[in-house]
């Protein structure tokens, strides 16, 4: 349902995708129970949500991971929601951190991030984690989205 | 405040209710500081939020639980946000998992789930957990809601 | 972008600020990548978001903290989202609890709270924690905001 041609609803919800890439940027796909309202928001290269219109957006990500204290670095597992705007430095919008579990072989934990941010036309948001190999890709565990206010 | 008769605000926020039922589906009530905007969203049988209008909804749940690794099964505590639509499979929309704490008698942890989904008229959303007896029902700890974009 | 003069967008996102105060109420600032849509929502005394218009709001907070089981009280770390309305008792809207980590010197954990609530003109929301000294103020770790539906 549209708010009107001038002010259509803009929303996206994408699903995590396991990746063989060694990058810390999580990969996403339009599969399963995803949402992509229209072409005013797009998933680019499977890694970032890019918006065409300026405005305030509620942006969120959920990451479930499985890690073990002994098998991981001493540093906690950190998930970061980041912003890339044309001609600007990349910015960290939100971060969450969870210390690794002592459970074996690994202990699952879930992180949720969300906040309201002003995005410029062409701005992209993406999610970084300290160790993508620890992320859980089972149904519903890891997802990423936004909605325009 | 209404957006207009054709496009009223639709939102709900309900509060967890302890239940003697052995079902894994959490029970909710319109009590305390709850929200129920109008009859376009209803709480049915104390267990599911049902919407009358098709559209994009941001749906969320928060579950606080108290568990102990030794007293619980090896499997983590999992909270699932699920969708029931007429004539369709029930669907897992979102899940979060937390490994049980080693704290005694139990260690509290909180899970937050949220995402944007398209709902059909008559669709219902509900929350499943692996062990409802571990859920914390103190003021503000466990809640469930949605808002129509 | 405005919905119209009669119905402007109202949203805020503020950033945590370390404080020498011994109060359990977290302090916030309009700094970094913050949002303050207009004067219909304001940050008062660095501690509460106050709204001028009645209506339904999605209110959220994220708190990252670092604690150790041995160095902390036995009680878990609790974050509370609270409401203060003119001439009414303060109310707890949402709470989340996490048991302290056994990691040394401390283990980081993140809490996310969010829900839809009716606010009256002049209502304020604020965030309480059991031990503000444990809160992490690094970029993006701890934030607080709202948006009017």
């Amino acid at each position: 349902m549209q708010k009107g041609d001038q002010n259509p609803q803009i929303a996206a919800h994408v699903i995590s995708e396991a990746s063989s890439k060694t990058t810390s940027v999580l990969q996403w796909a339009e599969k399963g129970y995803y949402t992509m309202s229209n072409n005013l928001v797009t998933l680019e290269n499977g890694k970032q949500l890019t918006v065409k219109r300026q405005g305030l957006y509620y942006i969120y990500a959920q990451v479930t991971f499985c890690s073990n204290r002994e098998a991981s670095s001493q540093a906690p597992f950190i998930a970061s929601l980041c912003l890339k705007s044309p001609g600007r430095f990349e910015r960290i919008l939100l971060r969450a951190a969870n210390t690794h579990s002592s459970a074996k072989p690994c202990g699952q934990q879930s992180i949720h991030l969300g906040g309201v941010f002003e995005l410029q036309p062409g701005a992209s948001v993406f999610v970084n984690v300290t160790d993508p190999s620890q992320v859980s890709h089972g149904t519903g565990f890891t997802s990423f989205g936004l909605l325009k206010l | 405040m209404q957006k207009g008769d054709q496009n009223p605000q639709i939102a709900a926020h309900v509060i967890s209710e302890a239940s003697s039922k052995t079902t894994s589906v959490l029970q909710w009530a319109e009590k305390g500081y709850y929200t129920m905007s109008n009859n376009l969203v209803t709480l049915e049988n104390g267990k599911q939020l049902t919407v009358k209008r098709q559209g994009l909804y941001y749906i969320y749940a928060q579950v606080t639980f108290c568990s102990n690794r030794e007293a619980s099964s090896q499997a983590p505590f999992i909270a699932s946000l699920c969708l029931k639509s007429p004539g369709r499979f029930e669907r897992i929309l979102l899940r979060a998992a937390n490994t049980h704490s080693s704290a005694k008698p139990c260690g509290q942890q909180s899970i937050h789930l949220g995402g944007v989904f398209e709902l059909q008229p008559g669709a219902s959303v509900f929350v499943n957990v692996t062990d409802p007896s571990q859920v914390s029902h103190g003021t503000g700890f466990t809640s469930f809601g949605l808002l129509k974009l | 972008m405005q919905k119209g003069d009669q119905n402007p967008q109202i949203a805020a996102h503020v950033i945590s600020e370390a404080s020498s105060k011994t109060t359990s109420v977290l302090q916030w600032a309009e700094k970094g990548y913050y949002t303050m849509s207009n004067n219909l929502v304001t940050l008062e005394n660095g501690k509460q978001l106050t709204v001028k218009r009645q209506g339904l709001y999605y209110i959220y907070a994220q708190v990252t903290f670092c604690s150790n089981r041995e160095a902390s009280s036995q009680a878990p770390f609790i974050a509370s989202l609270c409401l203060k309305s003119p001439g009414r008792f303060e109310r707890i809207l949402l709470r989340a609890a996490n048991t302290h980590s056994s990691a040394k010197p401390c283990g980081q954990q993140s809490i996310h709270l969010g829900g839809v609530f009716e606010l009256q003109p002049g209502a304020s929301v604020f965030v309480n924690v059991t031990d503000p000294s444990q809160v992490s103020h690094g970029t993006g770790f701890t934030s607080f905001g709202l948006l009017k539906l």
Epitope: G32, Y33, Y34, S37, G138, T139 | I92, E118 | -
Partner: nanobody
Framework: EVQLVESGGGLVQPGGSLRLSCAAS????????MGWFRQAPGKEREFIAV????????LYADSVKGRFTISADNSKNTAYLQMNSLKPEDTAVYYC????????????????WGQGTLVTVSS
């Protein structure tokens, strides 16, 4: 498109058990979830159980929780419904269905359906 063939239906006494099978062929790489519905005479088709192909997660209708178990053998491209403690009210035609990937929440994806298998619970 996915082709589905059910088997295992029949007549069983109250309290008895049956195991239904649903063999999939065709575009099996595009299966997101497989599950079961049933339709009793004069009633609407009713959801029973679903299993996610990706990780084996499952959901059940309240009416069968604790009595029915859905499972899948990916190597055989087959889903199963183990039905225990059967009751007369479980009598119906049981249909297997497959939901394809790419069926976003903004789309009502078309399911692929089997032809159905009759289960009769009677003494």
């Amino acid at each position: 498109e996915v082709q589905l063939v059910e088997s295992g239906g029949g007549l069983v006494q109250p309290g008895g058990s049956l195991r239904l099978s649903c063999a999939a062929s065709g575009s099996i790489d595009n299966i997101h979830a497989m599950g079961w519905f049933r339709q009793a005479p004069g009633k609407e088709r009713e959801f029973i159980a679903v299993i996610y192909w990706r990780d084996g997660s499952s959901l059940y209708a309240d009416s069968v929780k604790g009595r029915f178990t859905i499972s899948a053998d990916n190597s055989k491209n087959t889903a199963y419904l183990q039905m225990n403690s059967l009751k007369p009210e479980d009598t119906a035609v049981y249909y297997c269905a497959a939901e394809p990937y790419g069926s976003g929440s903004s789309l009502i994806s078309e399911y692929d359906w089997g032809q159905g298998t009759l289960v009769t619970v009677s003494s």
